[in-house]
Interface confidence: low
């Protein structure tokens, strides 16, 4: 685990003296943009517990591995969640501290709850200031549960969370209804990803047995040690007032770690420092108790005395957690009688010994079956034993056999033989077998005969399109079950290979031989039927169709609509990409065109039988031209136009449009609407005197129709310059009478 500690100073009489410090013991931690990566971050997390805005908090960096947050002005500033982030890359870790108001209505009996997957967690909120209203429990800020006020048991409200899973982790709160959220009891629930004593991806590995309240990390199996303890199993106590993974940090102030809460990476959570307890970590342990939160009991034997920071202090001649062990001639401890490793791995083998005088690194050696003696590369010295670690050279099959660990001191010697089995990772002898295929998936039996040693712990199926240079896709499967490769391309060949693994480091075998498996694409057999079509405009057509009802799933990806314009020799194709669709709107068609229309089901690239064709005639784009357009000058500024309605109209005319242009003029023509379509005459006014004009017109129904013939006419005599043409409509007969 990352060596990261968040310290909260709990002297709460004066908020301005409150501070949070994040300390990293990681090499190069917090050095900003240099090669060691991102800096330490320390901040208040307002996502779940929001407090009223106040002056910004002050962040001070003390060297490369420490950052402190100050500037709290009032008690409400303290309530909520604070987090420190440290470590680089994959080791980036967030440590969380939850602060409760000492004056809250409800207080947590215990803030941090670390439980194992599948356990029952019980959160207990103690009534501090009673209110006769319901208690609302929330999880990560969202409503979770309600308890009636009369459900308090011994002055506590309990929330039971049976069979907890990792997603249940987070911030829980208990609040009286209609009370300030700042008066809530806030809890932190940490759910390890494995059951008790287990760790690893499948929770198959056994935890080392963390001592002194250490918690086994569910990802890497390391013990996260309480503040004040160190060692791979937290077996060693630090000196009073020290913390950090190597006891390298010192509590600030003359009173040591008194009044400080320590928060460590999950799954540990938070606690007082070693030797202290209470909600503000200001109470020393009672006699006979020691460790973080004083949770541990000494139970010293043989004249040992209890130290509240380190536990039993043994008299000469005795050792052990409870001073229960006599010093003795050297002895090999807890050596497994049989070990198993995979071929070509370089395992580490540990050999532990105790005795008086105490064994040191050079006094423990390891002997291979061929007589080669290995010396330890590292030794972990603990109060009751020395553990020598041996880095074994790359294993060969000849290394199978009896090995021996030997310890020698001036007090004597001891040895222990144990058997090493070197196993060969499994290699498939055959390719996987194809069971069934569909257009986008293959069902494969991955279990094949293999050379090498079992048991098979993991089967990996590697696959990619044939002749492809892209990366292999990999799926990890259960050895005993068939596997479905999904989201494949239809009608495509895939190269598929099996890789087998056996338990232990280096247990992955070489890939087996490849085989070619091709996805299917059955031809769609259903023939659609055109049910109807509806002209929605001169260039828009709505089409509907049906499919015969047959049992079983519909084989098809969608529909293809085809329109054949025989006059122009052009085909238009429209793809409807849903096999559930039964209607489509075709737009952008050519008005006045005769189309032949059909529809067919498609699957992958295969087309099913086409429907019987339909013949559709779209209306022309607009009405025919008005007939017999005639222009007659009425004065020096007016010309009257008369016409006859177009013939064979497809619908009622909505308006006429008149185009007016000065003959030989270079400017744009002027268009004038005649909005009374029943008219057959209009007077264009505001023209210039003695000027020759060109006129033409067209009708509009849904679209503008064809232009009429162009007519010329000149205004009369010399008059004043007019402002510009305008139009006045009237019935043709009335205009002529005048």
């Amino acid at each position: 685990a990352v060596d990261l500690t968040l310290l909260a100073n709990l002297r709460l009489t004066d908020p301005q003296r409150f501070f949070l410090t994040c300390v990293s013991g990681e090499a190069g931690a917090g050095r900003g943009s240099d090669a060691w990566g991102p800096p330490l971050l320390l901040e208040k997390d307002d996502r779940i517990v929001r407090t009223p805005p106040g002056p910004p908090l002050r962040l001070a960096r003390n060297g490369s591995h420490q950052v402190t947050l100050r500037g709290f002005s009032k008690p409400s500033d303290l309530v909520g969640v604070f987090s420190c982030v440290g470590g680089a890359g994959a080791r980036r870790t967030r440590v969380i501290y939850v602060h409760n108001s000492p004056g809250a209505h409800l207080l947590p009996d215990k803030v941090t709850h670390t439980v194992n997957k599948g356990d029952t967690a019980v959160l207990s909120a103690r009534v501090h200031k009673e209110k006769q209203t319901d208690v609302i429990w929330k999880s990560n800020g969202s409503y979770f549960y309600t308890l009636d006020w009369h459900e308090a048991q011994d002055g506590r409200f309990l929330l039971q969370l049976p069979n907890v899973q990792p997603p249940s982790s987070g911030i829980y709160s208990a609040t009286y209804l209609e009370a300030s959220p700042l008066g809530s009891a806030f809890f932190r629930l940490i759910v390890r990803g494995c059951g008790a004593g287990r760790w690893g991806p499948g929770c198959t590995k056994e935890c080392p047995g963390c001592l002194h309240g250490g918690v086994c990390h569910d990802h890497d199996g390391e013990c996260v040690c309480p503040p004040g303890f160190t060692g791979t199993r937290c077996e060693q106590a630090c000196r009073e007032g020290r913390f950090g993974q190597s006891c390298q940090e010192q509590c600030p102030g003359i009173s040591g770690c008194r009044g400080l809460t320590f928060c460590l990476p999950d799954p540990y959570g938070c606690s007082c420092g070693s030797g202290w307890r209470g909600s503000q970590c200001q109470e020393a342990c009672a006699p006979g108790h020691f460790g973080a939160d004083c949770r541990l009991q000494c139970q010293c034997q043989n004249g040992g005395t209890c130290d509240r920071f380190s536990g039993c202090v043994c008299p000469s001649g005795w050792h052990g957690v409870h001073c229960e062990k006599s010093d003795r001639i050297p002895q090999i401890l807890n050596m497994a009688s049989e070990l198993e490793f995979n071929l070509e791995t370089m395992p580490r083998i540990n050999c532990a010994a105790a005795g008086n005088p105490f064994p040191v690194r050079g006094s423990i050696e390891l002997r291979k079956p061929d007589g080669t003696v290995l010396l330890s590369t590292k030794a972990i010295v603990e109060p009751e034993k020395t553990t020598a670690e041996f880095e074994v050279p790359r294993l060969v099959l000849a290394d199978s056999g009896f090995w021996e660990c030997r310890v020698s001191t001036s007090g004597g010697q001891d040895s222990r033989r144990f058997k090493v089995n070197v196993k060969v990772p499994p290699v498939p002898l055959a390719a996987p077998r194809l069971l069934t295929k569909q257009s986008r998936q293959l069902v494969v039996s991955p279990l094949v005969s293999f050379s090498g040693d079992g048991p098979i712990s993991t089967v990996r199926l590697h696959y990619r399109p044939q002749d492809s240079t892209m990366d292999w896709s990999t799926i990890v499967v259960d050895p005993s079950e068939n596997v479905t490769l999904m989201n494949l391309r239809p009608k495509t060949g895939y190269s598929v290979r099996v890789q087998l693994s056996r338990p232990g480091e280096g247990g992955e075998g070489a890939w087996g031989p490849p085989t070619l498996m091709t996805t299917d694409c059955p031809e769609p057999l259903l023939q659609p039927w055109l049910e109807g079509w509806h002209v929605e405009g001169t260039d828009r057509l709505r089409v509907s169709w049906s499919l015969p009802l047959v049992p079983g799933p519909l084989v098809g990806d969608g529909f293809l609509l085809r329109l054949w314009d025989g006059t122009r020799g052009q085909e238009r194709r429209e793809n409807v990409s849903s096999p559930q669709a039964r209607t489509a709107l075709l737009t952008g068609l050519t008005p006045g065109t005769h189309y032949q229309l059909d529809v067919q089901l498609y699957h992958c690239t295969l087309l099913g039988p086409a429907s019987p064709p339909a013949h559709v005639l779209l209306p022309p784009s607009g009405p025919p031209a008005p007939r017999h357009l005639h222009a007659q000058a009425l004065s020096d500024s007016e010309i009257q136009l008369t016409w006859k309605h177009p013939e064979a109209l497809p619908g009622p005319i909505s308006k006429y449009v008149v185009e007016v242009q000065v003959a030989g003029g270079a400017g744009d023509p002027l268009w004038i609407d005649v909005d009374r379509p029943e008219e057959t005459s209009t007077i264009i006014r505001g023209l210039n005197a003695s000027t020759r004009y060109l006129f033409r017109m067209r009708a509009s129904i849904q679209g503008l129709g064809d232009w009429s013939n162009t007519v010329e006419e000149s205004t009369l005599g010399n008059g004043l310059q007019a402002e510009g043409p305008v139009q006045e409509s009237r019935a043709a007969e009335e205009g002529l009478d005048q």
């Epitope: 029952t120 009636d148 011994d154 039971q160």
Partner: antibody, heavy 119, light 107 residues
Framework: EVQLLESGGGLVQPGGSLRLSCAAS????????MFWVRQAPGKGLEWVSV????????SYADSVKGRFTISRDNSKNTLYLQMNSLRAEDTAVYYC????????????WGQGTLVTVSS | DIQMTQSPATLSLSPGERATLSCRAS??????LGWYQQKHGQAPRLLIY???NRATGIPARFSGSGSGTDFTLTISSLEPEDFAVYYC?????????FGGGTKVEIK
């Protein structure tokens, strides 16, 4: 696996006494309220009594108040019901039950013990 | 005391049919209501708590609804093992009270 096992039932004369026990296992007994519920032959369920996790609070149905006493021994994971001044209408199967959370609902029940009050 | 009234007293149905059981409180119990199933000679089993939440291990065919005074337990499609007596129970006020029960029997 949660288990609740009642014992101590039997035949008793009106005015007599009996002490029922309920041995609990498979859960943290000291964390939950515990209940006694009874069921007269051929009748429905009737709540009798409840006790808080520490044993500091108790409550009784009016029909048994002053005659029955509920208690628990968390060190032995055992719930008790001391029944005095028994009447014919106390004849029933007595179930002990564990609460889900607070007093929310009774998620585990014992198989019951029959108490018969008759002369 | 809050009286809990269940109806009907008996419901005769065939396997596969939908069962709808009703429970009415003499005053509002908000959503603080549970449903239990009891088979002959056995202890009751918690089905639904707080009106609509299924207890651990209860099949999805059981569902609860309602708030205030009117509550419903629905069994969407009766299985042979569902023929039993069903009780509702309120936890809104002391004393805790149960309904008189609805017997679901095979037609």
């Amino acid at each position: 696996e949660v288990q609740l096992l009642e014992s101590g039932g039997g035949l008793v004369q009106p005015g007599g006494s009996l002490r029922l026990s309920c041995a609990a296992s498979g859960f943290t007994f000291s964390a939950y309220p515990m209940f006694w519920v009874r069921q007269a032959p051929g009748k429905g369920l009737e709540w009798v009594s409840v006790i808080s996790p520490s044993g500091g609070q108790t409550s009784y149905a009016d029909s048994v108040k002053g005659r029955f006493t509920i208690s628990r021994d968390n060190s032995k994971n055992t719930l008790y019901l001391q029944m005095n001044s028994l009447r014919a209408e106390d004849t029933a199967v007595y179930y002990c039950a564990k609460s889900f959370s607070g007093l929310a609902a009774l998620d585990f029940w014992g198989q019951g013990t029959l108490v018969t009050v008759s002369s | 005391d809050i009286q809990m009234t269940q109806s009907p007293a008996t419901l005769s149905l065939s396997p596969g049919e939908r069962a709808t059981l009703s429970c009415r409180a003499s005053q509002s119990v908000r959503t603080y209501l549970g449903w239990y199933q009891q088979k002959h000679g056995q202890a009751p089993r918690l089905l639904i708590y707080d009106a609509s939440n299924r207890a651990t291990g209860i099949p999805a065919r059981f569902s609860g609804s309602g708030s205030g005074t009117d509550f419903t337990l629905t069994i969407s499609s009766l299985e042979p093992e569902d023929f039993a007596v069903y009780y509702c129970q309120q936890r809104s006020n002391w004393p805790l009270t149960f309904g008189g029960g609805t017997k679901v029997e095979i037609k």
